[in-house]
């Protein structure tokens, strides 16, 4: 079942999952200047059994030059100053994690993708946060979010992370200096 | 929570034109793209373009190109759908959509009338 | 374009029965085909995407399945509330196109 809304925003921080559920879509963005391609599909899908999952649908990007589109008029920033959402990321994810059953590794970037990864997750997704670059992280509980449904409503739990402006950079799990694992850390519950 | 939440009933005369907004809450706006759909009794439901807020870039309904204008706000988190040169065929409920089609607005129903 | 065919306009159960809407598309869409419930008076609302994915808060009676052209909507234990139209729509490819729905009434 599809999360309603999209994980709780972190002041000066960012997430990402180390593996999908079976369920999660990831939109077919491009980059300024392409679009999806109009046969193509709106979104991969993670896909499959308990034993093999897999993203079903690619995602191909043409340039939108060669499209019946208009440009807007109210046209963003090239960059944001901030991603508030999943950055493009390295296929690479540890072992444990993406070989989970029902789960999907980050699929590989695919030509003229957008910088900024959009998903649409699904209950029971957790994902991880850290500071940007230029931040560090007090943590007053685990810096990550779950999707749970709790009386028919999708909510996200609300990860205990403070980022502050100081320059050090806390990691994803796997990466250099990992946070404490995330088993037998108290959940942060909101009541409904 | 995500909500869509369009402007109100319209009643307007044959060859004027007609502008409905469509007002985004609960998620980023410029990460989503926001689609338009007619429903006419007895003629279904049909998709009459989309708009990518964050990116600008629009695609119609070869149908529709021409009838409909889709714009977006990206600053009061709005997506704009102008009708024009309009006609009893343009009389039905008009929803917008977002997050692949997962919500819609209430509708704008919009009768066209001497 | 991908015409989405509803061959059947409307549909009568009664409470507690399975009932199966089918939805055929005019080319190979693969799973990229939704189902929407519509109530009197009211936008529709999204049931399944993907073919066989349910959202949050749609209960499981509801079963979606197919690819490729042909498409099923079940609705296992029919309950007097599932009284209304059913859509599918295909989103393979521009413009995206929906089926002329099948109202469900129940005896």
């Known amino acids: 079942e599809l999360c309603d809304d999209d994980p709780p925003e972190i002041p000066h921080a960012t997430f990402k999952a180390m593996a999908y559920k079976e369920g999660t879509m990831l939109n077919c963005e491009c980059k300024r200047g392409f679009r999806r391609i109009k046969s193509g599909s709106l979104y991969m899908l993670c896909t499959g059994n308990s034993s093999h999952s897999s993203w079903d649908n690619q995602c191909q990007c043409t340039s939108s030059a060669t499209r019946n589109t208009t440009k807007q008029v109210t046209p963003q920033p090239e960059e944001q100053k901030e991603r508030k959402t999943t950055e493009m990321q390295s296929p690479m994810q540890p072992v444990d994690q993406a070989s989970l059953p029902g789960h999907c590794r980050e699929p590989p970037p695919w030509e003229n993708e957008a910088t900024e990864r959009i998903y649409h997750f699904v209950v029971g997704q957790m994902v991880y946060y850290q500071c940007v670059q230029g931040y560090r992280a007090l943590h007053r509980g685990p810096a990550e979010s779950v999707c749970k449904m709790t009386h028919g409503k999708t909510r996200w739990t609300q990860p205990q992370l403070i980022c502050t402006g100081e320059m050090e950079t806390s990691q994803f799990p796997g990466e250099e200096k990992p946070q404490a694992s995330p088993e037998g850390r108290p959940e942060s519950e909101t009541s409904c | 929570q995500v909500q869509l939440q369009q402007s109100g009933a319209e009643l307007v005369r044959p060859g004027t034109s007609v502008k409905m907004s469509c007002k985004a809450a609960?998620?980023?706006?410029?990460?989503?793209?926001i689609g338009w759909v007619k429903q006419r009794p007895g003629h279904g439901l049909e998709w009459i373009g989309d708009?990518?807020?964050?990116?600008?870039?629009?695609d119609y309904n070869e149908k529709f190109t021409g009838k409909a204008t889709l714009t977006a706000d990206t600053s009061s988190s709005t997506a704009y759908m102008q009708l024009s040169s309009l006609t009893s065929e343009d009389s039905a409920i008009y929803y917008c959509?977002?997050?692949?089609?997962?919500?819609w607005g209430q509708g704008t129903l919009v009768t066209v009338s001497a | 374009d991908t015409t989405v065919t509803q061959s059947q306009k409307f549909m009568s159960t009664s409470v507690g029965d399975r009932v199966s809407v089918t939805c055929k598309a005019s080319q190979n869409v693969g799973t990229n085909v939704a189902w929407y419930q519509q109530k009197p008076g009211q936008s529709p609302k999204a049931l399944i995407y993907s073919a066989s994915y349910r959202y949050s808060g749609v209960p499981d009676r509801f079963t979606g399945s197919g690819s490729g052209t042909d498409f099923t909507l079940t609705i296992s234990n029919v309950q007097s509330e599932d009284l209304a139209e059913y859509f599918c729509?295909?989103?393979?490819?521009?413009?995206?196109?929906f089926g002329g729905g099948t109202k469900l009434e129940i005896k």
């Open positions: 609960g998620y980023t706006f410029t990460n989503y793209w």
């Open positions: 729509q295909q989103y393979n490819s521009y413009p995206y196109t």
């Open positions: 959509v977002s997050r692949n089609f997962a919500k």
């Open positions: 708009i990518h807020p964050g990116g600008g870039y629009i």
